[in-house]
């Protein structure tokens, strides 16, 4: 799903207030709901009819440092016999997410939000077929 | 996928530097890759064998203000005949994401990161548990 553009409103102070100095804002330390946990169904990436693999990217100057990307294993979907059926398609499910980028020069550290596109998994779909008639 | 805990390292300055004043950091205005876009296949939520609906939650003090959650429509999966087959299971695919929470008292505005669990879509899996017949 798509994150809408910030425009220039969310991070601004109300109009009646003095502007933010130096183009930066105050970010409080700590993360709300940091202990919340994902309870995804067990091994769904290998049990899915549109299975996927995971690749981990690592960047020490990004939070979270680890970003996991899924890649669909098949073009088609796995049928009841465990064979690939190309009359169906495995397609990625994507999500825009925010990460925090750390920038430092000596002891001067600042942070900036960054939009990252994550492929979270795959799903099996009936293809949309555009039949071309040749005359 | 799960976002690991921050610990207390990512947002801290190097040990040789003076600590961050008042438990807050400098967040630069603007978002890196703001114009990046999701290019998901069309209408996959209705074409999937594990279709889903979307619900939008809206919060003006959160960025992004709009967070979209998916709900699987079926217990089973949709077969080639368009019927629900409960020998297979529709399961949610979830992703932890970061949002920014805005807190203000008058002209004093600060921001804090918040972890949100988003259900992005659904996939069809072969069930692990098969009914045990008692004789």
């Amino acid at each position: 799903r798509k994150i809408p553009k910030v425009g220039h409103t969310f991070f601004q102070k109300p109009e009646s207030c003095p502007p933010v100095p130096g183009g930066s804002m105050k970010l409080d330390i700590g993360i709300i709901n940091e202990n919340q946990r994902v309870s995804m169904s067990r091994n769904i990436e290998s049990r899915s009819t549109s299975p996927w693999n995971y690749t981990v990217t690592w960047d020490p100057n990004r939070y979270p440092s680890e970003v996991v990307q899924a890649q669909c294993r098949n073009l088609g979907c796995i049928n009841a016999q465990g064979k690939e059926d190309i009359s169906m398609n495995s397609v990625p499910i994507q999500q825009e997410t925010l990460v925090v980028r750390r920038k430092h020069q000596g002891c001067s550290v600042s942070f900036q939000l960054e939009k990252v596109l994550v492929t979270v998994g795959c799903t099996c779909v009936t293809p949309v077929i555009h039949h071309v008639q040749h005359h | 996928r799960k976002i690991p805990k921050v610990g207390h390292t990512f947002f801290q300055k190097p040990e040789s530097c003076p600590p961050v004043p008042g438990g807050s950091m400098k967040l630069d205005i603007g978002i890196i890759n703001e114009n990046q876009r999701v290019s998901m296949s069309r209408n996959i939520e209705s074409r999937s064998t594990s279709p889903w609906n979307y619900t939008v939650t809206w919060d003006p003090n959160r960025y992004p203000s709009e967070v979209v959650q998916a709900q699987c429509r079926n217990l089973g999966c949709i077969n080639a005949q368009g019927k629900e087959d409960i020998s297979m299971n529709s399961v949610p695919i979830q992703q932890e994401t970061l949002v920014v929470r805005r807190k203000h008292q008058g002209c004093s505005v600060s921001f804090q990161l918040e972890k949100v669990l988003v259900t992005v879509g659904c996939t069809c899996v072969t069930p692990v548990i098969h009914h045990v017949q008692h004789h």
Partner: nanobody, 123 residues
Framework: EVQLVESGGGLVQAGGSLRLSCAAS????????VGWFRQAPGKEREFIGA????????YYAVSEKDRFTISRDNGKNTLYLQMSSLKAEDTAVYYC????????????????WGQGTQVTVSS
């Protein structure tokens, strides 16, 4: 993390009706398949039925199809079980349960369970 709390149980006359509720805490209630089980004295826990995350798909154990109705309200994070034409055999503790996968829930292997609410049908 999901906590489930059942309510609405009690003593009811045979032929009467009762609506059980199950309140869920946790902000991702709509991502869970939720359902009902019951356990009569001295018997095994018995599956009643389940409903999909969106509420579009409902499955009932064959024996209860006509008298029991399962529904959910994701806005209120609540699951319901409407029971009618109650019989003495319906006397049991009724449990609400949640899992992300119907296959686990259906066979009593759900990740989350409530404490149960007692229903007693007097003849």
């Amino acid at each position: 993390e999901v906590q489930l709390v059942e309510s609405g149980g009690g003593l009811v006359q045979a032929g009467g009706s009762l609506r059980l509720s199950c309140a869920a805490s946790g902000r991702t209630f709509s991502s869970y398949v939720v359902g009902w089980f019951r356990q009569a004295p001295g018997k095994e826990r018995e599956f009643i039925g389940a409903i999909s995350g969106s509420g579009d798909s409902i499955y009932y154990a064959v024996s209860e199809k006509d008298r029991f109705t399962i529904s959910r309200d994701n806005g209120k994070n609540t699951l319901y079980l409407q029971m009618s034409s109650l019989k003495a055999e319906d006397t049991a503790v009724y449990y609400c349960t949640a899992d992300q996968e119907f296959g686990y829930l259906r066979f009593g292997r759900s990740e989350y369970w409530g404490q149960g609410t007692q229903v007693t049908v007097s003849s």
